[in-house]
Interface confidence: medium
C-alpha cells in the first residue's frame, strides 16, 4: 500500500470549502479499508483530534466541531480518500493526516500529510487621530484591523485628486500609522486607510479638520 505524495498545503478563505487530498494505491481489494483522518490544530498542537473515520464499511464522526461539515469527496470505499471541510473556521487551520490501512496489504507509506491554512480577509480597520488638530501641530493617523490572516498591511491615502499624503507625512504600512508634521490647512480632508492581505481589502475613513486659531478681538 502506498499513499501518494500530497501537494503540501491547502489555503482557503474562511467560510469556504476546503478539499484535503489523499489517495493511495493497493494490491488488495478494498474489503477491509480503514481510513482515519486526524488533525494537529495550529492553535493546540498538543491535542490531535479525529476528523472523520471510515471503518468496516461505515463512516464515523470525529471531533464535535467537525460534525456536519466533513465528508469524503467520493463514494467509499475508494482509493481516493480525500475529504472536504465545509464552512471552514479559523480553528480548522492545522496539519491534517490521513492514515490508510487495507488488510492484507501491508508495508509502504500509509500516511499522507496536508497542511490547511484558513485565510481571513481584514476586518474593517479602526481609524484614529492622535494629537492636537491645531495648526502647526503634529498628528498621527492610526489604523488597525482586529482580524486578518495573513496579517494585513495598511496603506493610507488622502482622498483628493492626487491620492498622495502631504509632503510632511511619513507612513508605516506594517504598523498602519502616518505621522503628519506641522499640519496646515492643506492637511485637512478625508484620509482613507486600506487594510489588505492576500484575500481581501477593507477601509476606514478619517476626517482631519485642521483648526486655525480664531483672531482675537481687540
Amino acid at each position: 500500500l502506498e499513499v501518494s505524495e500530497s501537494p503540501g498545503s491547502v489555503q482557503v478563505a474562511r467560510g469556504q470549502t476546503a478539499v484535503l487530498p489523499c489517495a493511495f494505491s493497493t494490491s488488495a481489494a478494498l474489503l477491509n479499508l480503514n481510513v482515519i483522518w486526524m488533525v494537529i490544530p495550529l492553535s493546540n498542537a498538543n491535542q490531535p483530534e479525529q476528523v472523520i473515520l471510515y471503518q468496516g464499511g461505515q463512516m464515523f464522526d470525529g471531533a464535535l466541531r467537525f460534525h456536519g461539515r466533513v465528508g469524503f469527496t467520493g463514494t467509499m470505499p475508494a482509493t481516493n480518500v480525500s475529504i472536504f471541510i465545509n464552512n471552514t473556521q479559523l480553528s480548522d487551520t492545522g496539519t491534517y493526516q490521513c492514515l490508510v490501512n487495507n488488510l492484507p496489504d501491508r508495508g509502504g507509506r500509509n500516511i499522507g500529510v496536508t497542511g490547511l491554512t484558513v485565510l481571513v480577509p481584514p476586518s474593517a480597520p479602526q481609524c484614529q487621530i492622535q494629537g492636537s488638530q491645531d495648526l502647526g501641530s503634529d498628528v498621527i493617523l492610526l489604523c488597525s484591523s482586529e482580524e486578518g490572516i495573513p496579517r494585513p498591511t495598511y496603506l493610507w491615502e488622502k482622498l483628493d485628486n492626487t491620492l498622495k499624503l502631504p509632503p510632511t507625512a511619513t507612513q508605516d504600512q506594517v504598523q498602519g500609522t502616518v505621522t503628519i508634521r506641522n499640519i496646515s490647512a492643506l492637511s485637512s480632508g478625508l484620509y482613507q486607510c486600506v487594510a489588505s492581505n492576500a484575500i481581501g481589502t477593507s477601509t476606514c475613513l478619517l476626517d482631519l479638520q485642521v483648526i486655525s486659531p480664531q483672531p482675537r478681538s481687540v
Epitope: 480577509p121 481584514p122 476586518s123 474593517a124 480597520p125 479602526q126 481609524c127 484614529q128 487621530i129 492610526l142 488622502k158 482622498l159 483628493d160 490647512a185 492643506l186 485637512s188 480632508g189 478625508l190 482613507q192 481581501g200 477593507s202 477601509t203 476606514c204 475613513l205 478619517l206 476626517d207 479638520q209 485642521v210 483648526i211 486655525s212
Partner: antibody, heavy 126, light 107 residues
C-alpha cells in the same frame, strides 16, 4: 439653534445649470466638513458630494463627477453646489448635511450626518 | 463601492410591537454604521451612530447592534410617531452609501 437652510432649487431644462446654497447658523461652520445628499421622488437617499472644513478637499459620487462642483464660503457660513449639464435623473430633493465626529471609548473616530437642512427641490424637465 | 442592503423593504406593525430592521454590508465595515429616520416631506434624522450609540434626544426604545457586515435596528415598543422610513448608512469608505430604506407602516 443649530440650523441649515437650503435654497436655489427650481425647474430647469436638461443641459441647464443651477446653484444651490446652504446657509449654516448656530455652530462654527469652518470646523465641520459638509455634504450634499439627494433623494429622487419616492426613492432612497444618495450621497452626492462632500467638502472639508477648510474647503481644500472635495469629493463626489461617480454619478455627478465632472458636472457638479461643491464649494463653501466660510466667511458667509454658506455651502454651495454648482450643478451643470443637468439630466432628468438629477431630479431630487437636495439636502445639505453636517459631518459630526463621534469618539468611542476605544479612541477611534466615527462620523454621521447629525444636522440636516429641510431640503430644496430640483426638477430637471423639458 | 460598499453596497448596503436593508430588509425588509417595508413592514406593517401595530403600536406596542417590537420591530427589527436588518442591514447588511457587502464587506466588513466594523462599526461604521448609522441609522436615520425620515418622515414624509421631512429631512432625515440621526437615530443611531457607530452601530449602537444612541444620538442625543432619541428615545431609548431605539437600539442598534451589530458589527462587521450584519446590523440591526430595533424599536422595542413601536409608538405612533415611529411610523416612518428608516435608512442605514456606512462611513467606512467613499462613496458614502445608504441602504434602500425600510418603510414602517401602521397595520
Amino acid at each position: 439653534e443649530v440650523q441649515l437652510l437650503e435654497s436655489g432649487g427650481g425647474l430647469v431644462q436638461p443641459g441647464g445649470s443651477l446653484r444651490l446654497s446652504c446657509a449654516a447658523s448656530g455652530f462654527t461652520f469652518s470646523s465641520y466638513a459638509m455634504s450634499w445628499v439627494r433623494q429622487a421622488p419616492g426613492k432612497g437617499l444618495e450621497w452626492v458630494s462632500a467638502i472639508s472644513g477648510s474647503g481644500g478637499s472635495t469629493y463626489y459620487a461617480d454619478s455627478v463627477k465632472g458636472r457638479f462642483t461643491i464649494s463653501r464660503d466660510n466667511s458667509k457660513n454658506t455651502l454651495y453646489l454648482q450643478m451643470n449639464s443637468l439630466r432628468a435623473e438629477d431630479t431630487a430633493v437636495y439636502y445639505c448635511a453636517r459631518h459630526e465626529v463621534f469618539g468611542t471609548s476605544s479612541g477611534y473616530h466615527l462620523y454621521a450626518f447629525d444636522i440636516w437642512g429641510q431640503g430644496t427641490l430640483v426638477t430637471v424637465s423639458s | 463601492d460598499i453596497q448596503m442592503t436593508q430588509s425588509p423593504s417595508s413592514l406593517s406593525a401595530s403600536v406596542g410591537d417590537r420591530v427589527t430592521i436588518t442591514c447588511r454590508a457587502s464587506q466588513s465595515i466594523s462599526s461604521y454604521l448609522n441609522w436615520y429616520q425620515q418622515k414624509p416631506g421631512k429631512a432625515p434624522k440621526l437615530l443611531i451612530y457607530a452601530a449602537s450609540s444612541l444620538q442625543s434626544g432619541v428615545p431609548s426604545r431605539f437600539s442598534g447592534s451589530g458589527s462587521g457586515t450584519d446590523f440591526t435596528l430595533t424599536i422595542s415598543s413601536l409608538q405612533p410617531e415611529d411610523f416612518a422610513t428608516y435608512y442605514c448608512q456606512q462611513w467606512s469608505g467613499l462613496p458614502l452609501t445608504f441602504g434602500q430604506g425600510t418603510k414602517v407602516e401602521i397595520k
